[in-house]
């Protein structure tokens, strides 16, 4: 004969465990139902009655099967330098990622606390290391024979064109100017662009208890301007 199916709440076998989507309630000493994502435990189970679940209140969520008394508070609205890639719903926290051209300057346990604009290398300097979702651009002076005449977070130093007859010699921020005979280059012509970093890493706001238990606070911290690194601009 098949074993009788137990309905929650029920006392587990000695040394046994509760089934999937159930939890052991220490007070009732029974296996009780968990609440599904998007809900929380409104009333805990007793020996004779199962958990009573209720929907998460506005701007709160639970992502997992749970028996928490309050849903977690969604993180603050995304700031102007961020993009909301996942909305706050009853089942998921808001996710903010840095906009293109920005990187995560101040990370935290889950995601990013503060985005900052990628450094732009000024003329005479090129990108030595491109920005990523978590690191800034590194600029370097253009070596002899190369130049950059742009203010850019993606352009590297390019080789001067090679002239049969030089009208104006090139320098770190200007290409060589040739006389009318056609020039050649030591590399393929045209600006070399590094791709913008694509922000893919989830930047979850830190889950905090919903306001009825412990109010959360805004996670965007004011950060003063930092001096631009050598070869970069602050714009």
């Amino acid at each position: 004969l098949p074993a009788q199916v137990a309905f929650t709440p029920y006392a587990p076998e000695p040394g046994g465990t509760c089934r999937l989507r159930e939890y052991y309630d220490q007070t009732a000493q029974m296996c009780c139902s968990k609440c599904p994502p998007g809900q929380h435990a409104k009333v805990f189970c007793t020996k004779t009655s199962d958990t009573v679940c209720d929907s998460c209140e506005d701007s709160t969520y639970t992502q997992l099967w749970n028996w928490v008394p309050e849903c977690l508070s969604c993180g603050s609205r995304c700031s102007s330098d961020q993009v909301e890639t996942q909305a706050c719903t009853r089942e998921q926290n808001r996710i903010c990622t840095c906009r293109p051209g920005w990187y995560c300057a101040l990370s935290k346990q889950e995601g990013c606390r503060l985005c900052a604009q990628l450094r732009k290398c000024r003329p005479g300097f090129g990108v030595a290391r491109p920005g990523t979702e978590t690191s800034d651009v590194v600029c370097k002076p253009c070596a002899p024979g190369t130049f950059s005449n742009t203010t850019s977070s993606t352009d590297i130093c390019r080789p001067h064109q090679i002239c049969h007859v030089v009208a104006i010699p090139g320098n770190a921020s200007m290409d060589a100017v040739c006389t009318s005979t056609s020039p050649t280059r030591s590399m393929a012509p045209g600006a070399v662009h590094l791709p913008q970093p694509v922000s893919t890493r989830s930047q979850h706001t830190q889950p905090t208890p919903a306001p009825s238990t412990a109010p959360g606070t805004s996670f965007l911290l004011p950060v003063g301007p930092s001096p631009p690194a050598e070869g970069s601009t602050g714009d």
């Epitope: 506005d58 701007s59 603050s76 009853r90 306001p211 109010p215 606070t217």
Partner: antibody
Framework: EVQLQESGPEIVKPGASVKLSCTAS????????MHWVKQRPEQGLEWIGR????????KHDPKFQDKATLSSDTSSNTAYLQFSSLTSEDTAVYYC?????????????WGQGTTVTVSS | DIQMTQSPAIMSASLGERVTMTCTAS???????LHWYQQKPGSSPKLWIY???NLPSGVPARFSGSGSGTSYSLTISSMEAEDAATYYC?????????FGGGTKLEIK
């Protein structure tokens, strides 16, 4: 364009009931709340209650619990406020307002208001 | 219920003047759940500042909001004629959600 269109002005007798409507258009977010707010002449704003149109769940200020009934019709994107046992204290402008789930209750769109006058 | 007290109830300011009005909650309110609305006579309220310090699009940058816990404020860096209105604070921290009594801002 997002709009909340409320029903027209009402003149009702004391003790009667009135049902106000608020029709939403231009919204693409299903996770919203519709709130009702009361403003008596030359007075401030009072929150009456709100409804989650997707589930029909409502929440009231306890002082309006026996006076106000909130309902909605998802097929017409319309929220309703029924006020019963009207007295002169209920003479006011009633606004509907929308807040998206996850925006911490910020009411970002408001109807034009419905004036209710209770007079014998 | 959380009571929201706004002060002053009425104030007047000259054009170009810096204006600050305050909103005090009877118990702590999370900054995400504190909003301000502007209302002009004969018009519906408009969301003016959300989550303590954020401006919806269309609200001039001369407006700012700050605060935490039980004390919040709305500031206009330089008063303009179109700012004359009544401003209400609103808490959504704990139901029943409540509005302050309003601060009526007039031009001096």
């Amino acid at each position: 364009e997002v709009q909340l269109q409320e029903s027209g002005p009402e003149i009702v007798k004391p003790g009667a009931s009135v049902k106000l409507s608020c029709t939403a258009s231009g919204f693409n977010n299903k996770d919203i709340y519709m709130h009702w707010v009361k403003q008596r002449p030359e007075q401030g704003l009072e929150w009456i209650g709100r409804i989650d149109p997707a589930t029909g769940n409502t929440k009231h200020d306890p002082k309006f619990q026996d006076k106000a009934t909130l309902s909605s019709d998802t097929s017409s994107n319309t929220a309703y406020l029924q006020f019963s046992s009207l007295t002169s204290e209920d003479t006011a402008v009633y606004y509907c307002a929308h807040s998206p789930y996850g925006d911490f209750g910020a009411m970002d769109y408001w109807g034009q208001g419905t004036t209710v006058t209770v007079s014998s | 219920d959380i009571q929201m007290t706004q002060s002053p109830a009425i104030m007047s300011a000259s054009l170009g003047e810096r204006v600050t009005m305050t909103c005090t909650a009877s118990s702590s309110v999370s900054s995400n759940y504190l909003h301000w609305y502007q209302q002009k006579p004969g018009s519906s309220p408009k969301l003016w500042i959300y989550s303590t310090s954020n401006l919806p699009s269309g609200v001039p940058a001369r407006f700012s909001g700050s605060g935490s816990g039980t004390s919040y404020s709305l500031t206009i860096s330089s008063m303009e004629a179109e700012d004359a209105a009544t401003y209400y604070c609103h808490q959504y921290h704990r139901s029943p959600w409540t509005f302050g009594g309003g601060t009526k801002l007039e031009i001096k």
